[in-house]
C-alpha cells in the first residue's frame, strides 16, 4: 500500500485511507429524522460546494464517487509534520430558514498521532469549528477575529496504520449546536492546527416539531426555540367539521418533540371521528352534540334521511317533547285505562282501574278524571261543576284510583278516566278514556224553601210548596208541623204525599207557624224555615192566594 508519507509530499493526491474510508462509511449514512430539516448536507450536493480553503495548500477536496457514481465531497488535511499550522475551510453562506438554533453534524476520521513516526511534536488530534452570522450571502470574511468559536472537535476514535491494513476505518460523528441566531444566515469555518483529518460529511440542520394531527387538531411544522430547555406553545387548528371548547395547544420541545397537549377538537354535531377526520353521519344515524363520540342509530319510531343529522324525525303518530333528549325513542299517547270499576257510597264514588295496555313508550303516564252529570230523562250531560271534590286530585293522578265526594244524591254521573302522558298534548288524535256510569244513593232531601199560602179562612189555612231544590231521591211524603205562635210545645203534624195541605180546626184571628220537611227512602230532611200565617176574624172574608215572602 502507498505510504502515508505520500499524503504529505503530494497533498493533491487522495491517499488510500480516504478511499477506503469513504466506501465503508458512506454505506452507513442514514436518512435524517423527520424532525430535522437540513440546511446543508454535503453528501447530497451534486455540484461544487463552493467552499474556500485558506491557505490554498491547506484543506483540499477529494473528488470521489459512491457506488451510484454520485460525487462525494470530502475535505482532508494532513500537515502533521509542519509547525504552526492554521488551515481554514470556509463553507458557503447557509440560510437558517428562520431557525434560531441550528445543529452541525460532522463525520470525520482522525489519525492517531502516536501512530505517526517523527511527528509527535507537531501532530494534533483536534480541530476547531467556528461560525460567522451574516445577512449577506456574499459576505464571506476571512478575518479570523470575526468568527465565533463553536468548539474544539476531538475524535472518539482515531485510526492507526494497523487499521489501514485491515481496511477498518473509524468514522467519528460529532454534533454541536449554535444559537440563538439573529441574522438570516451564517458561514461555518473549520480550522486545522496540525491534525490528520478527513472531513467526510457536514450536515447543518435545525430541529422542528413536524406537523401532526392530534385529537382532531392540526399542529403546523414548528421550528424549535433557541434555548435547549425551551418549550414553545403552539396553537392547533381544528380539522374540517370539528369544534372545540378549549382551544387545542401543544408544546414543541427543543428536541423537536410534541409535548403536553392541552385541549382538543371534537367532531361537530352530525359528524363523527374516523381515521383522524370528521366524517358525516349517514342517513339513519345522528349525533346531537360534539361531546358525543360517534353517530348513533335513530332511536325507535324515528328516522332521518339526511346526512349530518343532529336529531331524528318522529314517525307518524309519534312525538317527542322538547325536554326529551334526542337519543330517546319517539313516543305516543297511551291507550285508554282498562277495567274501570266503581263503588258508590251515598254521595261519594270510588273509582279504580288498571293502567293502559300501551303506555305509548313513556313512563310519565298519569290520569285525568272528567265528571259529567247526566239527566236520565233527557239524556243530556253537563260538566259537574266546582262543588265536586276529588281525592287526592282530579288531574295528574299517578295511582289508579280516585274518590269523588260531595256529589249530588240520587244523580246519574258519567266519569271519564283518561290516560295521558308527556306527549298527549302534542297529539291531535282523540282522547283515550274509559267511561263509568254511576248513580249516587238517595239521601235525605234538602229543605223546602218555597211555600205559598192558599185559601185562608177563620178556622183553616191552605198551603202549597215546591219540591226541595235537591230532593236527593224520590220524595215519599212531606211532614207539615204547625202550632199557634208562642205555643211551640203544642204542635200538630200532618203528613201529605202532595205538595198542598189544608190545616183545619184553627182559631179565628190567630197566627200559626208552619214548617215543612220532605222524606225520601234515606229519611227526612230538615224542616224548612218558619212560615207564619194568620186566620181571619170571625166576620172577615177569606183571603186570596199569594206568595209569602
Amino acid at each position: 500500500p502507498a505510504s502515508l508519507a505520500g499524503c504529505y509530499s503530494a497533498p493533491r493526491r487522495a491517499p488510500l485511507w480516504t478511499c477506503l474510508l469513504l466506501c465503508a462509511a458512506l454505506r452507513t449514512l442514514l436518512a435524517s429524522p423527520s424532525n430535522e430539516v437540513n440546511l446543508l448536507d454535503s453528501r447530497t450536493v451534486m455540484g461544487d460546494l463552493g467552499w474556500i480553503a485558506f491557505p490554498k495548500n491547506g484543506w483540499e477536496e477529494i473528488g470521489e464517487v459512491d457506488e451510484n457514481y454520485a460525487p462525494i465531497h470530502t475535505y482532508q488535511v494532513c500537515k502533521v509534520m509542519e509547525q504552526n499550522q492554521n488551515n481554514w475551510l470556509l463553507t458557503s453562506w447557509i440560510s437558517n430558514e428562520g431557525a434560531s438554533r441550528i445543529f452541525i453534524e460532522l463525520k470525520f476520521t482522525l489519525r492517531d498521532c502516536n501512530s505517526l513516526p517523527g511527528g509527535l511534536g507537531t501532530c494534533k488530534e483536534t480541530f476547531n469549528m467556528y461560525y460567522f452570522e451574516s445577512d449577506d450571502q456574499n459576505g464571506r470574511n476571512i478575518k479570523e477575529n470575526q468568527y465565533i468559536k463553536i468548539d474544539t472537535i476531538a475524535a472518539d476514535e482515531s485510526f492507526t496504520e494497523l487499521d489501514l491494513g485491515d481496511r477498518v476505518m473509524k468514522l467519528n460523528t460529532e454534533v454541536r449546536d449554535v444559537g440563538p441566531l439573529s441574522k438570516k444566515g451564517f458561514y461555518l469555518a473549520f480550522q486545522d492546527v496540525g491534525a490528520c483529518i478527513a472531513l467526510v460529511s457536514v450536515r447543518v440542520y435545525y430541529k422542528k416539531c413536524p406537523s401532526v394531527v392530534r385529537h382532531l387538531a392540526v399542529f403546523p411544522d414548528t421550528i424549535t426555540g433557541a434555548d435547549s430547555s425551551q418549550l414553545l406553545e403552539v396553537s392547533g387548528s381544528c380539522v374540517n367539521h370539528s369544534v372545540t371548547d378549549e382551544p387545542p395547544k401543544m408544546h414543541c420541545s427543543a428536541e423537536g418533540e410534541w409535548l403536553v397537549p392541552i385541549g382538543k377538537c371534537m367532531c361537530k354535531a352530525g359528524y363523527e371521528e374516523k381515521n383522524g377526520t370528521c366524517q358525516v353521519c349517514r342517513p339513519g344515524f345522528f349525533k346531537a352534540s360534539p361531546h358525543i363520540q360517534s353517530c348513533g342509530k335513530c332511536p325507535p319510531h324515528s328516522y332521518t334521511h339526511e346526512e349530518a343529522s343532529t336529531s331524528c324525525v318522529c314517525e307518524k303518530d309519534y312525538f317527542r317533547r322538547e325536554s326529551d333528549p334526542p337519543t330517546m325513542a319517539c313516543t305516543r299517547p297511551p291507550s285508554a285505562p282498562r277495567n274501570a270499576i266503581s263503588n258508590v257510597n251515598e254521595t261519594s264514588v270510588f273509582l279504580e282501574w288498571i293502567p293502559p295496555a300501551d303506555t305509548g313508550g313513556r313512563k310519565d303516564v298519569s290520569y285525568y278524571i272528567a265528571c259529567k252529570k247526566c239527566n236520565s230523562h233527557a239524556g243530556v250531560c253537563e260538566e259537574c261543576g266546582g262543588h265536586v271534590r276529588y281525592l287526592p286530585r282530579q288531574s295528574g293522578l299517578k295511582n289508579t284510583s280516585v274518590m269523588m265526594v260531595d256529589l249530588l244524591a240520587h244523580t246519574n254521573y258519567t266519569f271519564e278516566i283518561e290516560a295521558v302522558n308527556g306527549v298527549s298534548d302534542l297529539s291531535p288524535g282523540a282522547r283515550q278514556y274509559v267511561s263509568v256510569n254511576v248513580t249516587t244513593n238517595q239521601a235525605a232531601p234538602s229543605p223546602v224553601t218555597n211555600v205559598k199560602k192558599g185559601k185562608i179562612a177563620k178556622n183553616s189555612i191552605s198551603l202549597s210548596w215546591q219540591e226541595p231544590d235537591r230532593p236527593n231521591g224520590i220524595i215519599l211524603e212531606y211532614e207539615i208541623k204547625y202550632f199557634e205562635k208562642d205555643q211551640e210545645t203544642s204542635y200538630t203534624i200532618i203528613k201529605s204525599k202532595e205538595t198542598t195541605i189544608t190545616a183545619e180546626g184553627l182559631k179565628p184571628a190567630s197566627v200559626y207557624v208552619f214548617q215543612i220537611r220532605a222524606r225520601t227512602a234515606a229519611g227526612y230532611g230538615v224542616f224548612s224555615r218558619r212560615f207564619e200565617f194568620e186566620t181571619t176574624p170571625v166576620f172577615a172574608a177569606s183571603s186570596d192566594q199569594s206568595q209569602i215572602p
Epitope: P283, G284, H305, E306, E307, A308, K316
Partner: antibody, heavy 120, light 111 residues
Framework: EVQLVESGGGLVQPGGSLKLSCAAS????????IHWVRQAPGKGLEWVAS????????YYADSVKGRFTISRDNSKNTLYLQMNSLRAEDTAVYYC?????????????WGQGTLVTVSS | DIVMTQSPDSLAVSLGERATINCKSS??????????MNWYQQKPGKAPKLLIY???NLESGIPDRFSGSGSGTDFTLTISRLEPEDAASYYC?????????FGQGTKLEIK
Amino acid sequence: EVQLVESGGGLVQPGGSLKLSCAASGFTFSTFGIHWVRQAPGKGLEWVASISGASTTIYYADSVKGRFTISRDNSKNTLYLQMNSLRAEDTAVYYCARYGTSFPYGLDYWGQGTLVTVSS
Amino acid sequence: DIVMTQSPDSLAVSLGERATINCKSSQSVDYDGDSYMNWYQQKPGKAPKLLIYGASNLESGIPDRFSGSGSGTDFTLTISRLEPEDAASYYCQQSNEDPFTFGQGTKLEIK
C-alpha cells in the same frame, strides 16, 4: 293514506327535454328522502336519483349524471326530475318512491309510474 | 358501483313448495352491524312493492311466508309456501352506497 302520483311523461325526440313531477300526499313530505327509479320496457329496475328531505343530499346514477336534475318543492309536496339531452336508452317507465322509516330503509311506497319515450 | 347479481334469472315452483332466490353483491353491503339489502316484488304493469328491508326485516303487511337472510355479500329471499299470487319478478337492491343498485331480477312462475 300515503300516495305518490307521477306525471309529465310522454314522447320526446332525442336531445330533447322533459320534466317529470311526483305529487305526494298522506305523509310529512319535507322529512322524507325520495328516489326516482326507472324501468326500460321488458327490463329490470334501474335506480336513477335521490334527494333528501331538505335537499341537502342529492345523488345520481352515472348514466344520467350531468343530464338529469332532481329537485323538490316542499311547500307543494312535489318532487321533480328535469331530464335534458334525452337519449333513446332513457326510454322507460319512471317511478318515484319514498324512502322508508324502518331502519335500514327501503323504498316503502311507490307511484304508479309515468312512461317516457325517447324516439325520433 | 356495487354490482348486484341475482340467481337464477327465472324459476318455476309448484304451489305450496319453497322458492329460493339468491343475490350476490360485488362488495359488502354491511355497515355498523346492519345489512343494507332490500327485496322487492313486481307484478306485470304494476309498481314494485317492498317485501324485505335490512336483509331480514319483513315490511308491514307482507305475509310471513316471505323471509330474507344473509349478510356481507350473500343474501337469500325465501318464499316458504308458494301461493298463486306470488308469481312475479323479484329484485334485490343494496342501499348501503350510492348509487342504490338493483339486481337484474328473477322471474318466478308457478308450475
